[in-house]
Interface confidence: low
């Protein structure tokens, strides 16, 4: 569950697209090694971020809802959660990531195929705000129609980086993998565990680009070792 | 319970043809893409064809692409599969099946005997 | 793409098999383990080269790095004895591939 996660480290307001696209914890899951695979971060692993307390939609980012973190949690106990991609369970527009709205209880693309000008009225059958999938969906989602001809634009499913455009990388979220960007200089980063451990790999980030590298920022060093922040900088 | 049940197998000579259906319950079907893996006797498992959630993209293996046709019918939980040219190497078990990593589900099978 | 399985793999009740699955550049791709029992169709063992669906017994384990993907069964019984398949989305073909798979044989 969720309250197994929530206790961990670090902050909240990343800049896009990292708040909420690794923002964020999710279920808890079993992850690979945390190990950097060459060109790619399929075993990258996460430190996961404190919990950003909300009372409405409108308080967390773009990519965010606010939302009870447990299935049938207090109302009062909200944070603010990763949106739900395409095809996953919803109960409002705003659980859906930007160019999906909630319909039957299902986020779906708000594109011209799917969209006809009305949004339509958000399904009233209570899910209870749980991270799980409709029907037990599986983690990565199953083949669709973006990810396998043009290379994926920021937000497309992917399997792995070379699914992706120049400058994104494929990084897992919430069950799915999805293109995000390399990180630039300045943003927050994963510093990789040594190989064998484990950790949490519901948001993963990307790896820094080129000529940088993921370093424990000097005016963390005074932090525990649970809370250092680590940043791309320079080599 | 999760149930895909599929039909249509049976005895057919060279070169003609033969539709397979999966009927799929307990799930909603319309959310998950669908495959056809086939398994000739005492051989391995051999994918055959996908097909999208929403029927808009559709791939096939090298040794069926052009004679069959993979379908579905989402207001009726069907998924099937168009056999054209049957070929003595297509005899094989039959199986529907999601493939969809923790929601892997498949059926029991149907037998295809292409002889003649 | 191409992977490649070894044909059988033989081991004594209570110690550990290990089933290969070779494939270029195969840890970049997710793997999924199905096992299949005479006349019954493959059940999914591992998925995502290390996830287990919850109904698997944690005996069965995986893992994926480089040019090989490993199943191991620790703790082997006579009733894991069956064929076992590795599978991955090969996106270059836009095609599912199967392993030609492993017989175990619980000695």
């Known amino acids: 569950t969720l309250n197994s996660v929530l206790n961990s480290n670090a902050i909240k307001n990343l800049p896009p697209p990292l708040g909420g696209a690794a923002g964020h914890p999710g279920s808890a899951v079993s992850a690979a090694p945390g190990i950097l695979y060459p060109g790619g971060n399929k075993y990258q692993t996460i430190d996961n971020y404190q919990p950003y307390p909300c009372a409405e939609d409108e308080e967390c980012g773009t990519d965010e809802y606010c939302a009870s973190p447990t299935r049938g949690g207090d109302a009062g106990v909200q944070i603010c959660l990763a949106c739900r991609k395409r095809r996953k369970r919803c109960m409002r527009h705003a659980m859906c990531c930007p160019g999906n709205y909630c319909k039957n209880g299902i986020c779906v693309s708000s594109d011209q195929n799917h969209f006809r000008g009305e949004i339509e009225e958000t399904i009233t059958e209570s899910f209870g705000n749980d991270h799980s999938t409709l029907d037990g969906y599986s983690r990565r989602t199953t083949l669709s129609s973006k990810m396998y001809h043009t290379k994926g634009q920021e937000g497309s499913v992917c399997l792995r980086s070379s699914d992706c455009a120049s400058g994104l990388c494929c990084a897992r979220h919430f069950w799915s993998k999805i293109c995000k960007p390399v990180l630039k200089e300045g943003q927050v980063c994963t510093k990789h565990r040594r190989k064998g451990s484990h950790g949490l790999e519901i948001f993963q980030r990307c790896y820094c680009g080129e000529g940088l590298s993921c370093r424990i920022q000097k005016d963390h060093h005074q932090a525990s070792n649970s809370s250092r922040l680590h940043t791309c900088q320079r080599h | 319970q999760v149930q895909l049940v599929e039909s249509g197998g049976g005895v057919v000579q060279p070169g003609r043809s033969l539709r397979l259906s999966c009927a799929a319950s307990?799930?909603?079907?319309?959310?998950?893409?669908m495959h056809w893996v086939r398994q000739a006797p005492g051989k391995g498992l051999e994918w055959v064809a996908i097909?999208?959630?929403?029927?808009?993209?559709?791939y096939y293996a090298d040794p069926v692409k052009g004679r069959f046709t993979i379908s579905r019918d989402n207001s009726k939980n069907t998924l099937y599969l168009q056999m054209n040219s049957l070929r003595a190497e297509d005899t094989a078990v039959y199986y529907c099946?999601?493939?969809?990593?923790?929601?892997?589900?498949w059926g029991q099978g149907t037998l295809v005997t292409v002889s003649s | 793409y191409v992977l490649t399985q070894p044909p059988s793999v033989s081991v004594a009740p209570g110690q550990t098999a290990r089933i290969t699955c070779g494939g270029n550049?195969?840890?970049?791709?997710?793997v999924h383990w199905y096992q299949q029992k005479p006349g019954q169709a493959p059940v999914l063992v591992v998925y995502?080269?290390?996830d287990r669906p919850s109904e698997i017994p944690e005996r069965f384990s995986g893992s994926n790095s480089g040019n090989t993907a490993t199943l191991t069964i620790s703790r082997v019984e006579a009733g894991d004895e069956a064929d076992y398949y590795c599978?991955?989305?090969?996106?270059?073909?836009?095609?599912?591939?199967f392993g030609g798979g492993t017989r175990l044989t619980v000695l």
């Open positions: 307990g799930f909603t079907f319309s959310r998950y893409d």
């Open positions: 099946a999601t493939l969809a990593a923790a929601f892997d589900y």
């Open positions: 097909i999208f959630y929403d029927g808009s993209n559709k």
């Open positions: 550049n195969i840890g970049s791709k997710s």
């Open positions: 599978q991955v989305w090969d996106s270059s073909s836009d095609h599912v591939v």
């Open positions: 995502d080269d290390s």
